[in-house]
Amino acid sequence: APRGTQAEESPFVGNPGNITGARGLTGTLRCQLQVQGEPPEVHWLRDGQILELADSTQTQVPLGEDEQDDWIVVSQLRITSLQLSDTGQYQCLVFLGHQTFVSQPGYVGLEGLPYFLEEPEDRTVAANTPFNLSCQAQGPPEPVDLLWLQDAVPLATAPGHGPQRSLHVPGLNKTSSFSCEAHNAKGVTTSRTATITVLPQQPRNLHLVSRQPTELEVAWTPGLSGIYPLTHCTLQAVLSDDGMGIQAGEPDPPEEPLTSQASVPPHQLRLGSLHPHTPYHIRVACTSSQGPSSWTHWLPVETPEGVPLGPPENISATRNGSQAFVHWQEPRAPLQGTLLGYRLAYQGQDTPEVLMDIGLRQEVTLELQGDGSVSNLTVCVAAYTAAGDGPWSLPVPLEAWRPGQAQPVHQLVKEPSTPAFSWP
């Protein structure tokens, strides 16, 4: 750092004073010197380092009429809003000719009530769940002791015995306020008061109780909610989308979910209006007067297949001698699953019904036994899925084939040998 030489007497006639105060204080340090000839620029040092961006003003007053006469030079350094970084030893420095002169030092000190660097923040926590709060304060003067308060009651009786910068709370069962007090030799400062809101714990063990093609019954175990009873639980279901895929912890579904509210208890809900044979993801959250719990992870579930809701359409049945030609179209009503095939039944007056599994074909040629003279022959068709048969169509009478009518061309289906019968 620059040092004055002793070859000449110091030009300083006034040195910086001392300032000690609390944070935010505004103060001024002042240097005065008397020089002969052109007045020099006064620089300020803090702890031996030149302050490049000092808020200083310099006033120069001539003591005579000639430029070579003496001048009084006053430099004032303004400190606005005193901070810890402003503290230290201050000196003025001038260059006169080939010599450097520094004033006697003045000192700037910071001393006041504790100042918070960190204060506890508002937050929500699940009931009976551990969490931490932070508080940090500094002087000077040091030491600074911290006292934590919960609902305005001190949590310890002595510094060194209670928690300091971090408070570990093993769990709460009611919404509470926390603050910390910082004590030093100047007194006490109180932090902001943080409100810790106690929410219900996340529900557990979300599971299926029963499945129907268009509804699922689900149940769960509620988490603890402290002193606040649960008011309701909310269940969300969303169609699974393999393209996007709901991750176990993904906070939001890829599409608008189907939302249902359940009064509690019981912690059970029937979700209706679902699509059969469809994968869903479901999750649940429970709410008290303080707010909702976090959602459970998404649980993959699937509605089972149902039977087709309607019979095959546009059934036509014609007869040509000992052959009958039957064809139909897929049901217009929802299949509620994967179509596995069709069943066909035909029956004549006074004859037993014959049942056949046609598979996925939508037309069949029947080889009728006997001379085909049976009267009032009717045909019914039903579609089926893994869940079972859908409704049968209304009986369609077998009409005699007229020349010019189209005739299906495919493999003939002999009537089953068992049970065997023939029309007279």
């Epitope: 002791d145 009786t157 510094p159 060194g160 015995h161 030799a185 100047k186 006490v188």
Partner: antibody, heavy 118, light 107 residues
């Protein structure tokens, strides 16, 4: 149980130094708390004099700052008051106490009466 | 320094009565006021700190209230052992300062 006991001379001559000892039992003065001296003048007026913090730092009443010193001997679990240049105005009952944080004082000694007289 | 004015300086009451003692600070001391009981031959007893926090082991008939500059100590349903000297003290800033005291005597 925590106990504090003051000891020292009953009589001190003006311009001399007053020295008192506070012996603490049942608690280590380096563990926690601030350890104070308070005095009560005839007529019951109480004056806080200063403390020594468990860390060793001190804080004094500005009205006494030029005359007061509080020190400790951690091996004996004692802390001390020295008041220099006493006058008859320093005649009082002197108490040592422990403060709850930098709060109020939760344990006091019985007090020791000191008269400044020639 | 913060000046503390305590009133009344003398109070006579009967067992079973409720009494109040007041302290006024010369400037705001937030909530940081303590109350002590002094009895001959006994060590001073801390009753209340931070304006209204009851010190451990003190009966609930003692209560404190107030903040800023005006504070009150209330003793409800006086017991014979409550007749003593009472002092208030601010612990908001140093130097700590005390009220002049209130002597509570049996009527």
């Amino acid at each position: 149980d925590v106990q504090l006991q003051e000891s020292g001379p009953d009589l001190v001559k003006p311009s001399q130094s007053l020295s008192l000892t506070c012996t603490v039992t049942g608690y280590s003065i380096t563990s926690a708390y601030s350890w104070h001296w308070i005095r009560q003048f005839p007529g019951n007026k109480l004056e806080w004099m200063g403390y020594i913090h468990y860390s060793g730092s001190t804080n004094y009443n500005p009205s006494l700052k030029s005359r007061i010193s509080i020190t400790r001997d951690t091996s004996k679990n004692q802390f001390f008051l020295q008041l220099n240049s006493v006058t008859t105005e320093d005649t009082a009952t002197y108490y040592c106490a422990r403060s709850l944080w930098f709060y109020a004082m939760d344990y006091w000694g019985q007090g020791t009466s000191v008269t400044v007289s020639s | 320094d913060v000046q503390i004015t305590q009133s009344p300086s003398y109070l006579a009451a009967s067992p079973g009565e409720t009494i109040t003692i007041n302290c006024r600070a010369s400037k705001s001391i937030s909530k940081y006021l303590a109350w002590y009981q002094e009895k001959p031959g006994k060590t001073n007893k801390l009753l209340i700190y931070s304006g209204s926090t009851l010190q451990s082991g003190i009966p609930s008939r003692f209560s404190g209230s107030g903040s800023g500059t005006d504070f009150t100590l209330t003793i409800s349903s006086l017991e014979p052992e409550d007749f003593a000297m009472y002092y208030c003290q601010q612990h908001n800033e140093y130097p700590w300062t005390f009220g002049g005291g209130t002597k509570l005597e049996i009527k």
